[in-house]
Amino acid sequence: QNASRGRRQRRMHPNVSQGCQGGCATCSDYNGCLSCKPRLFFALERIGMKQIGVCLSSCPSGYYGTRYPDINKCTKCKADCDTCFNKNFCTKCKSGFYLHLGKCLDNCPEGLEANNHTMECVSIVHCEVSEWNPWSPCTKKGKTCGFKRGTETRVREIIQHPSAKGNLCPPTNETRKCTVQRKKCQKGERGKKGRERKRKKPNKGESKEAIPDSKSLESSKEIPEQRENKQQQKKRKVQDKQKSVSVSTVH
């Protein structure tokens, strides 16, 4: 673990001084620190055309430290690197560069994208969604009774949000038209007083939805379903069979 004596030839500057500044153990007027006090790191700083030795508690930005048995030494990282593990492996790049597998790059390779927060090249993350949840009950205006046609919805969750270059999420909500067996509203399910009362026999061509009583008919004239002729009804039946899908939420 000790340094081998045979190959060591320490060339000291003539003006070697023991009365050194700061953490220097030995120094010279011309070269600054030549060696450091225990636990301090020796680094060479370029000042103009000459290099000056300095002693530091840790290596500065752009350098990495090696604790040899006889000296703690700072070694320069590559030019584009701010923090490195050693000469080969950068761990943080200088501004304007992106870190990828220990190297600093101007641009991230194909299939990767730049994370401008960490300044690293990262894998492109595509959106991932869960399976659809079951369809909700068929409802109209929030009620599940007293009508024939309504809408039902289903949702799915986003499992993985996409990164900047990732594929966008598909819709997470789907709504479609639905039909239900005509079901009389129970007392607690009634809408506005007296409006949900069912007529004895709906006329041919009327919808099976609950319709207002005769008094309200006078004021409202006809409800839309009563206005439909037979051709329109046929058209509607075909559309219902196709259960057209409309999308409400996109991420």
Epitope: Q1, A3, R8, Q9, F85, N86, K87, F89
Partner: antibody, heavy 116, light 107 residues
Framework: EVQLVESGGGVVQPGRSLRLSCAAS????????MAWVRQAPGKGLEWVAT????????YFGDSVRGRFTISRDNSKNTLYLQMNSLRAEDTAVYYC?????????WGQGTMVTVSS | DIQMTQSPSSLSASVGDRVTITCLVS??????FVWYQQKPGKAPKLLIY???RLQDGVPSRFSGSGSGTDFTLTISSLQPEDFATYYC?????????FGQGTKLEIK
């Protein structure tokens, strides 16, 4: 492509000497501290010695200090390990490696067997 | 010298398994820590440096974690080519020291 090619291994009697060489290519040899790491048959890895990039300082593991010397010739991109007073326990595969805190590049190894 | 205690010394697992190898260090070494993989008859290969950074060409199923004295190598889903011996090494100070190795075998 980085290449480290060891040579000089073989069978040698206890007390005798052997010199291993390692020819480097594919990287700037003179920028790197170089080391020898060995592995006895069926055992783990053991650091043997390191010489710094310019050859001015060298460091040795306790088990070889005083018997082994490490040297380099940067003009030839070659690393050496001079092994004297060899013992049975020095029997191992000897790997030449670029040592910069971690051992980044490795040779394929050369087998040294110390046996009477 | 800094002591490295690697465990387990051997481990049997199946393809697809998640495997964890640990290394305990006798003093705080921050993240100055490396993992190697060695296959029979071959030289060791550097897998992870600075405790958690993957070397170029190493599959993303390998990951390293830890800082200070406790370090972990995880293989998320073992592949046939991952059966090998794994070594940890501290790069904090001289002399460089290795763990005794973990031999990962097929169950």
């Amino acid at each position: 492509e980085v290449q480290l090619v060891e040579s000089g291994g073989g069978v040698v009697q206890p007390g005798r000497s052997l010199r291993l060489s390692c020819a480097a290519s594919g990287f700037t040899f003179s920028d790197y501290d170089m080391a020898w790491v060995r592995q006895a048959p069926g055992k783990g890895l053991e650091w043997v010695a390191t010489i710094i990039y310019d050859g001015s300082r060298a460091y040795f593991g306790d088990s070889v200090r005083g018997r082994f010397t490490i040297s380099r010739d940067n003009s030839k991109n070659t690393l050496y390990l001079q092994m004297n007073s060899l013992r049975a326990e020095d029997t191992a595969v000897y790997y030449c490696t670029a040592h910069d805190r971690s051992f980044d590049y490795w040779g394929q190894g050369t087998m040294v067997t110390v046996s009477s | 010298d800094i002591q490295m205690t690697q465990s387990p010394s051997s481990l049997s697992a199946s393809v697809g398994d998640r495997v964890t190898i640990t290394c305990l260090v006798s003093e705080d070494i921050s993240n100055d820590f490396v993992w190697y993989q060695q296959k029979p008859g071959k030289a060791p290969k550097l897998l992870i440096y600075a405790a958690s950074r993957l070397q170029d060409g190493v599959p993303s199923r390998f990951s390293g974690s830890g800082s200070g004295t406790d370090f972990t190598l995880t293989i998320s889903s073992l592949q046939p080519e991952d059966f090998a011996t794994y070594y940890c090494q501290q790069s904090y100070k001289y002399p460089p020291t290795f763990g005794q190795g973990t031999k990962l075998e097929i169950k």
